[in-house]
Interface confidence: medium
């Protein structure tokens, strides 16, 4: 366990031309506040996925009124750090979003109004226990300067806050196999205490009180060998009794979502959908009012004047969730017809159409025969965008410009031999077969089985196919 700490140093116009106008004025005094969202790993979807490592909201900064005619200076900031506690190990790599919000304090009906001034996002590597890291990020014409660090909460230490430390039991040394806890040299690394009864051979733990099984073992204490046979169902009745290989507890088993939140499994973890008034990874953050600015991504907060009354976030287009924290994947609705690829541009959807289709949703089938000519008496066939020629006998190719070999498709059945002919092809049938393509067997008594040979043609004679 530990805490991620963020110190905002300044927020103001960035270098270069085009300085932004001050967000506040004499008519509209305002103050700033900040939100930070953290996720483990080098996530590419910084704005969309939930803040799995945690989120924090700053206090409001001092009220600021622009001096007439003056350029926008660095704006007055809230006091103190933004702190995001993390319960589990620090992941080492993380993604962040820092949002700068403006609270307008004019004569709005229904209280103050909030608007998002800037959002910056990034991906960083950071070891817990290290020094403050400084950063500068730009969002449009604005520039944000800040520092951050991750620190472990005692008794945890180490770059991931997974080692535990205890005061030394003897003044001079640590116990057998235990190292001093740098930088706390007067303390010793504490052994992890796994769940009572956890098999020392087949189980291990990364957090106190847990019991995780090595491959081939199962059960709450990792004492049951896995057998892959005789399993009745994917989550069989009892792995402990049958020795069946069953999935470990699903991430939603036992519902980790507090305060009535509903849990859904994700490929690597779980996601809580929180009722109004609650947010956080496990819906554990409560007592939120509109004054806390609970709506992400420019959502408008209504109601919730005190902690006992619920607020509602009215989300802008493209966002959803009780706090507007989820981006709507509008492309998942598969709006593009005929195999078009979907691009969600934020303000609009675009479809990239496959060849032969057009229209906002690729719904129009282009007639590719328009203005096309097929040579040698061929006719153009519209094939959903594919320019196709149906060629006259003896010709082939995309535009019927090539002389075709009528025998290439091996049209003569039952071992008949094919001969190209000026009017098409001729099949010389093997003994016992007849017909234009040698498709009809001849009965031993000489009577053919459908249809009768044309007059003057003996079975086995070449059959011309016109």
């Amino acid at each position: 366990a530990g805490v991620f700490e963020l110190q905002i140093h300044s927020f103001g116009p960035g270098p270069g031309p085009g300085a932004p106008r001050s967000p506040c004025s004499a008519r509209l005094p305002c103050r700033l506040f900040f939100r930070v969202c953290l996720k483990p790993g080098l996530s590419e979807e910084a704005a969309e996925s939930p803040c799995a490592l945690g989120a924090a909201l700053s206090a409001r900064g001092p009220v600021y009124t622009e001096q007439p005619g003056a350029p926008a200076p660095d704006l007055p900031l809230p006091d103190g750090l933004l702190q995001v506690p993390f319960r589990d190990a620090w992941p080492g790599t993380f993604s962040f979003i820092i949002e700068t919000w403006r609270e307008e304090l004019g004569d709005q009906i229904g209280g103050p109004a909030w608007s998002l001034l800037a959002r910056v996002a990034g991906r960083r590597r950071l070891a817990a226990g290290g020094p403050w890291a400084r950063d500068i990020q730009r969002a449009g014409a604005w520039e944000l300067r800040f520092s951050y660090r991750a620190r472990c909460e005692p008794p945890a230490v180490g770059t991931a806050c997974t080692r535990l430390c205890r005061p030394r039991s003897a003044p001079s040394r640590c116990g057998p196999g235990l190292r001093p806890c740098a930088p706390l040299e007067d303390e010793c690394e504490a052994p992890l205490v796994c769940r009572a009864g956890c098999s020392p051979e087949h189980g291990f733990c990364e957090q106190p009180g847990e019991c995780r099984c090595l491959e081939g073992w199962t059960g709450p204490l990792c004492t049951v060998p896995v057998s892959t046979s005789s399993c009745l169902s994917p989550r069989g009745p009892s792995s402990a009794t049958t020795g069946c290989l069953v999935p470990g507890p699903g991430p939603c088993d036992g519902n980790p979502c507090a305060n009535g939140g509903s849990c859904s499994e994700t490929p690597r973890s779980f996601e809580c959908t929180c009722p109004r008034g609650f947010y956080g990874l496990r819906c554990e953050v409560s007592g939120v009012t509109c004054a806390d600015g609970p709506c992400f991504n420019g959502g408008l907060c209504v109601g919730g004047a005190d902690p006992d009354s619920a607020y509602i976030c009215h989300c802008p287009p493209g966002f959803q969730g009780s706090n507007c924290e989820k981006r709507v994947d509008r492309c998942s609705l598969q709006p593009c017809r005929n195999g078009g690829l979907c691009l969600d541009l934020g303000h609009a959807l675009r479809c990239r159409c496959r060849a032969g289709f057009a229209g906002p949703r690729c719904e129009h089938d282009l007639d590719d025969c328009a203005g096309r000519a097929c040579a040698n008496g061929g006719t153009c066939v519209e094939g959903g965008g594919a320019h196709r020629c149906s060629c006259a006998l003896g010709f082939g190719g995309r535009d019927c410009r090539e002389r075709a070999d009528p025998c290439a498709a091996r049209p003569c059945a039952h071992g008949g031999r094919c001969y190209a002919h000026f009017s098409g092809l001729v099949c010389a049938c093997a003994p016992g077969y007849m017909g234009a393509r040698c498709e009809f067997p001849v009965h031993p008594d000489g009577a053919s089985a459908l249809p009768a040979a044309p007059p003057g043609l003996r079975p086995g004679d070449p059959q011309r196919y016109l």
């Epitope: 598969q334 195999g339 690829l341 691009l343 032969g356 959903g384 965008g385």
Partner: antibody, heavy 119, light 107 residues
Framework: EVQLVQSGAEVKKPGASVKVSCKAS????????MHWVRQAPGQRLEWMGV????????NYNQEFKGRVTITVDTSASTAYMELSSLRSEDTAVYYC????????????WGQGTTVTVSS | DIVMTQSPDSLAVSLGERATINCRAT??????LAWYQQKPGQTNKLLIF???TLQSGVPDRFSGSGSGTDFTLTISSLQAEDVAVYYC?????????FGGGTKVEIK
């Protein structure tokens, strides 16, 4: 001659990931989209997704709940399909297939890569 | 998703005879249906697309018909090399979906 040559068979444990490659030759790689399709033993073919190699824009079958990622390396004329959080029901033959650019979706197919998921 | 239902599951036809396979979609897919041939040890082969357009190089004993929800693949004169499993697939909208397959054998 258009050819799609896929990587060899893989055996994986549940929870792991697998990355299958598909090397294209005989045509301009960035001019044709690439599909991935799988077929579990005794089952029908199942479309997984498609990518436009010219800019890596992709569309995925939502059935896979974000477990599938399709990428390309245009310098190597190779498409990749990665499937994460594998389960036993992901045991299948995985195919890449070239999109014909007209309405026929898949005109050339790879030979298939067998992925077995077993503990 | 659009569900594609193929019938029959298997079909035994004499050499030179006609083979007919049906495919039905749960909603209209206009003409956007493809047929594929799958043989062991060979790559899958596109036969027909847009319901009735013959893919280049495919023998003209193969033909496709239908639109909306009901489609048919016909092999006018079955040859030994036509023994295979045949799949229909809608290419009208994502996710593309396939039928369950029809195994064609020689009687």
């Amino acid at each position: 001659e258009v050819q799609l040559v896929q990587s060899g068979a893989e055996v994986k444990k549940p929870g792991a990931s697998v990355k299958v490659s598909c090397k294209a030759s005989g045509y301009t790689f960035t001019s044709y989209w690439m599909h991935w399709v799988r077929q579990a033993p005794g089952q029908r073919l199942e479309w997984m997704g498609v990518i436009d190699p010219s800019d890596s824009l992709a569309n995925y079958n939502q059935e896979f709940k974000g477990r599938v990622t399709i990428t390309v390396d245009t310098s190597a004329s190779t498409a990749y399909m990665e499937l994460s959080s594998l389960r036993s029901e992901d045991t299948a033959v995985y195919y890449c297939a070239r999109d014909s650019t007209v309405v026929a979706p898949m005109d050339y197919w790879g030979q298939g890569t067998t992925v077995t998921v077993s503990s | 998703d659009i569900v594609m239902t193929q019938s029959p599951d298997s079909l035994a036809v004499s050499l030179g005879e006609r083979a007919t396979i049906n495919c039905r979609a749960t909603k209209s897919i206009s003409k956007y249906l493809a047929w594929y041939q799958q043989k062991p040890g060979q790559t899958n082969k596109l036969l027909i697309f847009s319901g009735s357009t013959l893919q280049s190089g495919v023998p003209d004993r193969f033909s496709g018909s239908g639109s909306g929800t009901d489609f048919t693949l016909t092999i006018s004169s079955l040859q030994a090399e036509d023994v295979a499993v045949y799949y229909c697939q809608q290419h009208h909208e994502y996710p593309y979906t396939f039928g369950g397959g029809t195994k064609v054998e020689i009687k």
